[in-house]
């Protein structure tokens, strides 16, 4: 009798369970970017450290060639911060010269690439006008949200201007994802 | 026969499982900071509310003396927002006086302290130049990412200038972590 | 003997377990806002896309009339980003005209409404002074944190000025929550 009571609830509750510790996860950190050919009208992608310091990939979440590879379908939390730094922005130089105020901007995009789909999908975008009057400016853009991803999807981080990315510290610029 | 088929898969799948509801979690909220001796060349740490209002700690995640104590090893999502506020920044005053533009800045760092390791580790940093021209400025810095932490690790939030932290509302300045 | 050893640990470990895949989750994305009557002294709430594109609700997490409905009690991670955009802010216009510097501001609030409680609770606030000197400015405010929510709670996103919200892209302005 005990066995009969137990069996159905066991089957009902535990079938799709899995240990949290074996879920795909990655936290990637910034490195100095190497010069690459950027496609016209397309923001360049950052490449990342995946092993040293705070960086890691685990449980079949792999990093290769600027992409995080999604090893199994499910809902993932995906995040990135990019810290930008520059000199006085064009906007204030132009303003001082009495010409129209065209603000510079900085943009971060987390992009999903699906091989079976021709166009990349922009999952997250953080974009900010920069019209600083100090001689040096620096600021982060942070992004994070949950997405339903498919096995084989690839994630990358694109930025509007790779030359402005602060690559000096692993805690300033980073990229990560984990299966919920 | 059925029993024989069942046993191995049971052992294989369920061994490391644990209930989500008993995972270590904390959300801490801002309080007015009390005067403490600040170490030169080291950003001061904030202290926090851990019980009242929206704040809580649970499942052996404890808060003591500005630190969140990590009660078990694993991958944690760690986050904080600090809202800063001030009056016209020095940068714009200097600019008006025709002297070189030295921007002020605001910085938040989430730091890990491991007793067995002499130097704290900076997990996350958000840093921003402030060169505001209005009479009052205010802005948040948000940080969040996943880290592999060890039992006994301690987390704190350090800021570049404790005197500019907005302590007025629990939803403006906060700090949290949860085991994934 | 084997059975006797097995039973207690089974009862001890697995009782409150549940499959990750059936947890309430939602990611909502921006749509053009329809004009509504705003209550005086109360920030207007945004309404959202919940099905098309990147947006989804699942596992009894429902969206209705600007609210995310919490279907079961537990700890949730709640997040939102709102991208604002505008012309030169009032602050810089006033400054140019030689009047006192009153900066504009932009604010995002994630609010919890509990039917049994008369006053809404502000869970998260991101507020930023805007004193831009370029002719066009745009910037995001990101928020995210963990909260203990009760079945029946409702979440919404309020903004200081609905007319400044960038509704042009689903990746720029979004709102989500998931049970941990």
């Amino acid at each position: 009798l005990k066995g009969q009571e137990f069996a159905p609830s066991h089957q009902q509750v535990y079938a799709p369970l899995r240990a949290d510790g074996d879920k795909p996860r990655a936290h990637l950190t910034v490195v100095r970017q190497t010069p690459t050919q950027h496609l016209k009208n397309q923001f360049p992608a950052l490449h990342w450290e995946h092993e040293l310091g705070l960086a890691f990939t685990k449980n079949r979440m792999n990093y290769t060639n600027k992409f995080l590879l999604i090893p199994e379908s499910g809902d993932y939390f995906v995040y990135s911060q990019v810290t930008f730094r520059g000199m006085t922005s064009e906007c204030s130089e132009i303003r001082q010269a009495g010409r129209p105020n065209k603000p510079d901007s900085i943009t971060v995009v987390i992009t999903k690439v699906t091989d079976s789909y021709p166009e990349p999908t922009q999952l997250l975008m953080g974009t900010k006008s920069v019209c600083e009057v100090g001689s040096n400016w620096f600021q982060p853009i942070y992004l994070g949200a949950m997405f339903s991803l498919q096995e084989g999807d690839k994630l990358m981080v694109n930025v509007s201007d790779i030359s402005l990315v602060d690559y000096t510290k692993e805690d300033k610029t980073f990229f990560g994802a984990f299966l919920l | 026969l059925k029993g024989q088929e069942f046993a191995p898969s049971h052992q294989q799948v369920y061994a490391p499982l644990r209930a989500d509801g008993d995972k270590p979690r904390a959300h801490l909220t801002v309080v007015r900071q009390t005067p403490t001796q600040h170490l030169k060349n080291q950003f001061p740490a904030l202290h926090w509310e851990h019980e009242l209002g929206l704040a809580f700690t649970k499942n052996r995640m404890n808060y003591t003396n500005k630190f969140l104590l990590i009660p078990e090893s694993g991958d944690y999502f760690v986050y904080s927002q600090v809202t800063f506020r001030g009056m016209t920044s020095e940068c714009s005053e200097i600019r008006q006086a025709g002297r070189p533009n030295k921007p002020d800045s605001i910085t938040v760092v989430i730091t890990k302290v491991t007793d067995s390791y002499p130097e704290p580790t900076q997990l996350l940093m958000g840093t921003k130049s402030v060169c505001e021209v209005g009479s009052n400025w205010f802005q948040p810095i948000y940080l969040g990412a996943m880290f592999s932490l060890q039992e006994g690790d301690k987390l704190m939030v350090n800021v570049s200038d404790i005197s500019l932290v907005d302590y007025t509302k629990e939803d403006k300045t906060f700090f949290g972590a949860f085991l994934l | 003997l084997k059975g006797q050893e097995f039973a207690p640990s089974h009862q001890q470990v697995y009782a409150p377990l549940r499959a990750d895949g059936d947890k309430p989750r939602a990611h909502l994305t921006v749509v053009r806002q329809t004009p509504t009557q705003h209550l005086k002294n109360q920030f207007p709430a945004l309404h959202w896309e919940h099905e098309l594109g990147l947006a989804f609700t699942k596992n009894r997490m429902n969206y209705t009339n600007k609210f995310l409905l919490i279907p079961e009690s537990g700890d949730y991670f709640v997040y939102s980003q709102v991208t604002f955009r505008g012309m030169t802010s009032e602050c810089s216009e006033i400054r140019q005209a030689g009047r006192p510097n009153k900066p504009d501001s932009i604010t995002v609030v994630i609010t919890k409404v509990t039917d049994s409680y008369p006053e809404p609770t502000q869970l998260l606030m991101g507020t930023k002074s805007v004193c831009e000197v370029g002719s066009n400015w745009f910037q995001p405010i990101y928020l995210g944190a963990m909260f203990s929510l009760q079945e029946g709670d409702k979440l919404m996103v309020n903004v200081s000025d609905i007319s400044l919200v960038d509704y042009t892209k689903e990746d720029k302005t979004f709102f989500g929550a998931f049970l941990l």
Epitope: - | R32, Q33, T34, P35, T36, Q37, H38, R85, G86, M87, E90, S135, N136, D161, I162, S163, L164, V165, Y167, T168, K169 | -
Partner: antibody, heavy 120, light 107 residues
């Protein structure tokens, strides 16, 4: 016990300068923001300036911006207010007051005040 | 700047009276308000902070209440030592600003 003692007040002609001092004792001076607040004869209280505990942030009322400079010497437990280009409307009793850690907060201790009279 | 308006500007009362002073802010300041007492020729003294918290050493006959834009200082039973001028001050946003004062005098 906490003590704040102002000095340096006096009579000065318009356009001239004056430097006020505030000697602090009975607390850890270097841990608190410090303020100057003034009160014109027969009038109410007006906040003048604040300096953060470490001296890194200094904010001023619009009425004195560009003319007054607040500073502190934590090794001497002393707060200063350098007042330049003085005007008749700067005539007041000047109080130094202790704030909290945040530079925007209440004032829990006040000095006895020092009178500054700007007159030709 | 946030304007703080106190009323009345002068109040005549007798020892033992219950006295209420009102302070209004031109915009919401949550609970970030302090009350001070000042006697002629003396420095102000902190009575109440955070709208309702009694400063250490201040008699319990003083109490503060309110939030948002409307605040009150109440003296439950006026004592001879309480005849003075009272000021409210907001510290919700820069710059900190004071009310014009309320003088409590002997009737």
């Amino acid at each position: 016990q906490v003590q704040l003692v102002e000095s340096g007040g006096g009579v000065v002609q318009p356009g001239r300068s004056l430097r006020l001092s505030c000697a602090a004792s009975g607390f850890t001076f270097s841990s608190y923001a410090m303020h100057w607040v003034r009160q014109a004869p027969g009038k109410g209280l007006e906040w003048v300036a604040v300096i953060s505990y470490d001296g890194s942030n200094k904010y001023y009322a619009d009425s004195v911006k560009g003319r007054f400079t607040i500073s502190r010497d934590n090794s001497k437990n002393t707060l200063y207010l350098q007042m330049n280009s003085l005007r008749a409307e700067d005539t007041a009793v000047y109080y130094c007051a202790r704030g909290q850690v945040a530079i925007l907060d209440y004032f829990d201790y006040w000095g006895q005040g020092t009178l500054v009279t700007v007159s030709s | 700047d946030i304007q703080m308006t106190q009323s009345p500007s002068t109040l005549s009362a007798s020892v033992g009276d219950r006295v209420t002073i009102t302070c209004r802010a031109s915009q919401s300041i949550s609970s970030w308000l302090a009350w001070y007492q000042q006697k002629p020729g003396k420095a102000p003294k902190l009575l109440i902070y955070d709208a309702s918290s009694l400063e250490s050493g201040v008699p319990s006959r003083f109490s503060g209440s309110g939030s948002g834009t409307e605040f009150t200082l109440t003296i439950s039973s006026l004592q001879p030592d309480d005849f003075a001028t009272y000021y409210c001050q907001q510290y919700n946003s820069y710059p900190p600003t004071f009310g014009g004062g309320t003088k409590v005098e002997i009737k």
